[in-house]
Amino acid sequence: DAGVIQSPRHEVTEMGQEVTLRCKPISGHNSLFWYRQTMMRGLELLIYFNNNVPIDDSGMPEDRFSAKMPNASFSTLKIQPSEPRDSAVYFCASSL
C-alpha cells in the first residue's frame, strides 16, 4: 500500500495567488483529515470528512480556505487568496 499520497510536495507562490493541495487517502479509509503545522501555532486540525461529507471545518474559519472531497479517493484543500502567514506544512491523513 502506497499510503496517503499528497501533491505537490513543495509549493512556492506569490501572495494573493490561489493554491490547491491534493490528497489521495488510503483505499478503504472512510475518514480524511487536513492539518496545518507551523512553529508558532503547532499542529492544527483544519477539517475532516467522513464518507466524503465534511464533518467539522471549524479549524478553518477564514473563508479563504475551502476543502472538497468529491469522491472516496480524492480531496483538495484550496487557499484563495493566499497570504504569507499561510506558509506551513499541510498534512493529509486518513483513517478507517
Epitope: 501555532r41 503547532g42 499542529l43 492544527e44 486540525l45 483544519l46 464533518i55 467539522d56 471549524s58 479549524g59 478553518m60 474559519p61 477564514e62 473563508d63 479563504r64 484563495q80 487568496p81 497570504e83
Partner: antibody, heavy 117, light 106 residues
C-alpha cells in the same frame, strides 16, 4: 433550541481580571467553533476571539493578544474568555456566538463588563 | 487588517421603501455576511456567503456583491426592519465588522 448564555461579567478595577463563561445547549457543542464579540456602550461590534471545536485553532484581535485567552471545555459545553490587565476601554457587552454557515449564526444575550475605579 | 466601511452610517426611510446599504472593504474579500441588531438585543444573522438568507429571514432581504463592494437590499421596508445593520468579513483574521448603518423611521 440553540441557547448560549453568557455569565461572569461585572464591575472590575483597571488592571483587574475577569473570566467570562458561555454555557451552550441545544446543539452538539463539541462540533462547532465559537467566537467572542464585544460592543462598547453606544458603539459598533468588535470581534474579539475565535476557537475551533477541538481548540487547536485559535485567533485573537491584534489589540487583545496577550491579555485575553479563549478556551473551552467540551465536557461541560462551556466556552470561556479569561481577561487580564483590564482597561477602561474594555468596558462593553461581551457576546459569545456559534460559528455556523461560515458566520455567527447564533448569539447569546451578552454579559456586561465595566472597568472603572 | 481589512477595514469595512458601510454607507450610509444613518438612513431615514419609510415603511414600503426600498433601501440599499453598501459595505466596502479596504482589501478584496471572498464573501460578506450581514447582521441585524435591535436596541438592547444581540445581533442576528441575516445573510451569509454574500447572498444566502439565514433561516427564518424574510425574502425581502437580499445580498449581492463581489471583490471590494457588497450590498444589502431590503425591497419593501417593514416596521420591524428599523434597526442597525452590520457587515462582516471572514476572509482573513481578524474578522472585522463594518461600523454599522442605523436605519431609522422617517
Amino acid at each position: 433550541e440553540v441557547q448560549l448564555v453568557e455569565s461572569g461579567g461585572g464591575l472590575v478595577q483597571p488592571g483587574g481580571s475577569l473570566r467570562l463563561s458561555c454555557a451552550a445547549s441545544g446543539f452538539t457543542f463539541s462540533n462547532f467553533g465559537m467566537h467572542w464579540v464585544r460592543q462598547a456602550p453606544g458603539k459598533g461590534l468588535e470581534w474579539v476571539s475565535y476557537i475551533s471545536s477541538g481548540s487547536s485553532t485559535i485567533y485573537y484581535a491584534d489589540t487583545l493578544k496577550g491579555r485575553f485567552t479563549i478556551s473551552r471545555d467540551n465536557s461541560k459545553n462551556t466556552l470561556y474568555l479569561q481577561m487580564n490587565s483590564l482597561r477602561a476601554e474594555d468596558t462593553a457587552v461581551y457576546y459569545c456566538a456559534r460559528r455556523g454557515n461560515g458566520a455567527m449564526d447564533y448569539w447569546g444575550q451578552g454579559t456586561t463588563v465595566t472597568v472603572s475605579s | 487588517d481589512n477595514q469595512l466601511t458601510q454607507s450610509p452610517s444613518f438612513l431615514s426611510a419609510s415603511v414600503g421603501d426600498r433601501v440599499t446599504i453598501t459595505c466596502r472593504a479596504s482589501s478584496s474579500v471572498n464573501y460578506i455576511y450581514w447582521y441585524q441588531q435591535k436596541p438592547g438585543k444581540a445581533p442576528k444573522l441575516l445573510i451569509y456567503y454574500t447572498s444566502n438568507l439565514a433561516p427564518g429571514v424574510p425574502s425581502r432581504f437580499s445580498g449581492s456583491g463581489s471583490g471590494n463592494e457588497y450590498t444589502l437590499t431590503i425591497s419593501s421596508l417593514q416596521p420591524e426592519d428599523f434597526a442597525t445593520y452590520y457587515c462582516q468579513q471572514f476572509t482573513s483574521s481578524p474578522f472585522t465588522f463594518g461600523q454599522g448603518t442605523k436605519l431609522e423611521i422617517k
